[in-house]
Interface confidence: low
């Protein structure tokens, strides 16, 4: 009698590794013998697609060799024409070994930057993917951790950073090992020791001692007065990434001695500075012809501001210059506290370098004037709003006297470093942080953002520099 | 040495796709940005997209958002530019060039190697 | 979107002359400018970063300059391997302009 098809053995879950053989078994009882048909994701399977075997009238399905694409529910429907057609299905799931398939790379970068190392994987179960560095698994903190995608993210590198990786990627089935890979932390240029400055005798004998540290080591060259050292012997020693110069001299007129540590990351250098006078008792006293003498700041309203010991120009034209230059300071810095929290402090490091400007010793002492670019920095990033507010106030008269057009200085008239970059004076203390600048606009108008206003800077490292540093 | 070899251009019809490849080798992409800059014959320098990969930050010129999408392999060090929807205007030599830095510090840096570049026509 | 617009766009000079190429930015924008210069058939290269720099291996008779919104490229004495098309190029965070650029020829 004829018989509606009935599968006896329904599809069940099949498991199967990945180049190895899958059969899926469809029993079926009915009378005429029913016609089979396989499908993948409700995809028919084609009878002649080589990549399967279709036996036994249809009733056992093979996949000859497993690929991790395979993955899927897999059904068959038996149907003879009697009664109705009648389904089976079930899901092939692909068991694979762990694999990495985009392994980590050497990576070179700087100090206080970001490093991704990369270590992407397939396999089922998902593996989990674990670091070594060396020889012992990586511990994740605050600063290092593994990613979803089995990356490796390290803030804020630090030296010991520095080493060899690898990444391993683990299910049930196994092991993988990408192969080692090197991160190697390079570190800008900075001044660990920086030269003293001494005041002696004309004739004597002084050693400037100036130490640094970075990755590569840096250079140590000298500077004297803006010029490379034309005199004087350099002695230096290299231990543990730490360059020690010793700059001998033999004293015959007061100078700027400037020790420049330089190191290369690619194709760029990073740099830092630190400089000493060296001045000659009894030489520096106002001469009838000089408009003014060298001599260390001992004021207070500046004495944040500018660099410790530094040299600065006290100009004779007043009777008491020290107290006469004090006093224009003091005045315009009460005007100061008013402005906003971005223009206070990049105002009080222009004010005090304008008024006390920086000195260059010699037969005649020469008063060294900000450079233009800090100015304009100040100008038109820093204080725009409260620049136009001053120069209107001027223009209308409101001062009550002129006292505060000496420490506001025109920009324009100032030299540019571009000219030369002895002739004029950076400014240090433009300290600022990134909750106040949310005032300037963004670069760009693609996307928000709010960025730091990138104030023109020449090659040296950073534009905050610490007091016992000269930018000169 | 760092170098950058870019490869992927020919002849295209408008409305057709290609696939702009650009192997860096002397550094790493992960640690750079890597840029497209086009250059139409007789014409200047026009900027096409950047990405900094360690960030996986991207951007895209106003002329070619929606069509072009540039991308990084930072196994294979390489980077490319997958061109959608191509017009004549598209026409050009595609440069791939790199700066250091993620996109926060590599503007200052300037775009400090570049690769020969690989000619893009767009023609029926 | 900010724009770069330079000028001169060409410009004819002798062995030795002074030149000067200026970028002007359309509103106000940090100091991530650079200078480049290119030959036919060639690729640009990188003379000048952070609108002042002077990138390593460039003779130093290029440099760069900035003024508020202008920006100067400047060769203080022209020599033959100078006659060249430069490009000033401007980047913020999210995006990256170019200028018209400017053709040097001999005159």
């Known amino acids: 009698l004829p018989k509606a098809p009935v599968i006896t053995t329904p599809l069940e879950t099949v498991d199967a590794l990945v180049e190895e053989v899958a059969t899926f078994m469809c029993a079926v009882e009915s009378y005429p013998q029913p016609e089979i048909s396989w499908t993948r994701n409700k995809i028919l399977i084609k009878l002649f697609d080589t990549r399967y075997s279709i036996r036994e009238n249809g009733q056992l399905l093979t996949i000859l060799s497993v690929e991790d694409s395979d993955d899927g529910i897999y059904c068959c429907t038996a149907n003879n024409g009697v009664g109705g057609a009648v389904e089976s299905c079930g899901a092939l799931q692909v068991k694979m070994k762990p694999k990495i398939t985009r392994p980590p790379i050497n990576v070179k970068i700087i100090e206080g930057l970001k490093a991704v190392l990369p270590c992407t994987t397939m396999g089922n179960p998902k593996p989990s993917v674990s670091w070594i560095k060396g020889d012992s698994p990586l511990r994740e903190n605050s600063r290092i951790a593994v990613l979803e995608s089995g990356s490796l993210r390290i803030h804020n590198v630090q030296k010991e950073d520095a080493g060899q990786y690898r990444c391993v990627a683990k299910n049930s089935l196994g092991t993988a090992y990408s192969k080692v890979v090197k991160l190697e932390v390079e570190v800008f240029a900075r001044i660990l020791r920086a030269p003293e400055s001494h005041n002696v005798t004309f004739g004597s004998f002084v050693t400037l001692h100036c130490t640094a540290t970075g990755i590569p080591v840096p250079t140590i060259t000298w500077i004297e007065n803006g010029n490379a050292v034309s005199s004087g012997s350099i002695q230096e020693s290299v231990k543990d990434r730490v360059i020690d110069s010793r700059l001998q001299l033999f004293i015959t007129k007061p100078g700027l001695y400037t020790c420049i540590a330089t190191n290369k990351h690619g194709e760029k250098f990073s740099t830092a500075k630190a400089a000493a006078t060296i001045s000659i008792a009894e030489w520096s006293k106002p001469q009838k012809d000089n408009k003014g003498y060298c001599a260390q700041y001992r004021g207070e309203v500046c004495n944040a501001v500018l660099a410790k010991d530094a040299l600065v120009f006290l100009n004779t034209s007043y009777a008491d210059p020290e107290e006469a230059q004090e006093l224009l300071v003091h005045t315009a810095w009460n005007e100061l506290k008013v402005v906003s929290p971005v223009c206070r402090p990049a105002a009080e490091a222009l004010l005090c370098n304008h008024i006390f400007q920086e000195c260059s010793p010699g037969v005649v002492p020469t008063p060294i004037p900000i450079c233009r670019e800090y100015c304009l920095a100040v100008k038109e990033l820093f204080c725009a709003k409260e620049w136009l507010v001053m120069e209107e106030k001027t223009h209308r008269g409101l001062y009550r006297s002129e006292m505060h057009l000496l420490s506001v200085p025109e920009c324009s008239k100032l030299p540019s470093m571009h000219w030369d970059p002895t002739a004029c004076a950076r400014l240090p203390h433009l300290d600022y942080n990134k909750e106040n600048l949310k005032t300037f606009p963004p670069m760009t108008s693609s996307k928000p953002s709010v960025d730091i206003p990138n104030l023109p800077s020449s090659s040296s490292s950073s534009f905050s520099v610490s007091p016992t540093y000269s930018m000169t | 040495e760092v170098q950058l070899v870019e490869s992927g251009g020919g002849l295209v019809q408008p409305g057709g796709s290609l696939r702009l490849s650009c192997a860096a080798s002397g550094f790493t992409v992960s640690s750079s940005s890597i840029h497209w800059v086009r250059q139409a014959p007789g014409k200047g320098l026009e900027w096409v997209a950047s990405i900094s990969s360690s960030y996986g930050s991207t951007s895209y010129a106003d002329s070619v958002k929606g069509r072009f999408t540039i991308s990084a392999d930072t196994s294979k060090n390489t980077a490319y530019l997958q061109m959608n929807s191509l017009r004549a205007e598209d026409t050009a030599v595609y440069y791939c060039?790199?700066?250091?830095?993620?996109?926060?510090?590599?503007?200052?840096?300037?775009?400090?190697?570049w690769g020969q570049g690989t000619l893009v026509t767009v023609s029926s | 979107d900010i724009q770069m617009t330079q000028s001169p766009s060409s410009l004819s000079a002798s062995v030795g002359d002074r030149v000067t190429i200026t970028c002007r930015a359309s509103q106000s924008v940090s100091s991530a400018v650079a200078w480049y210069q290119q030959k036919p058939g060639k690729a640009p290269k990188l003379l000048i970063y952070s609108a002042s720099s002077l990138y390593s291996g460039v003779p130093s008779r290029f440099s760069g300059s900035r003024s508020g919104t202008d920006f100067t490229l400047t060769i203080s004495s022209l020599q033959p391997e100078d006659f060249a098309t430069y490009y000033c190029?401007?980047?913020?965070?999210?995006?990256?302009?170019f200028g018209q650029g400017t053709k040097v020829e001999i005159k």
């Open positions: 190029q401007q980047s913020g965070v999210w995006l990256i302009t």
């Open positions: 060039a790199r700066s250091e830095g993620d996109r926060y510090v590599s503007g200052y840096m300037g775009l400090d190697y």
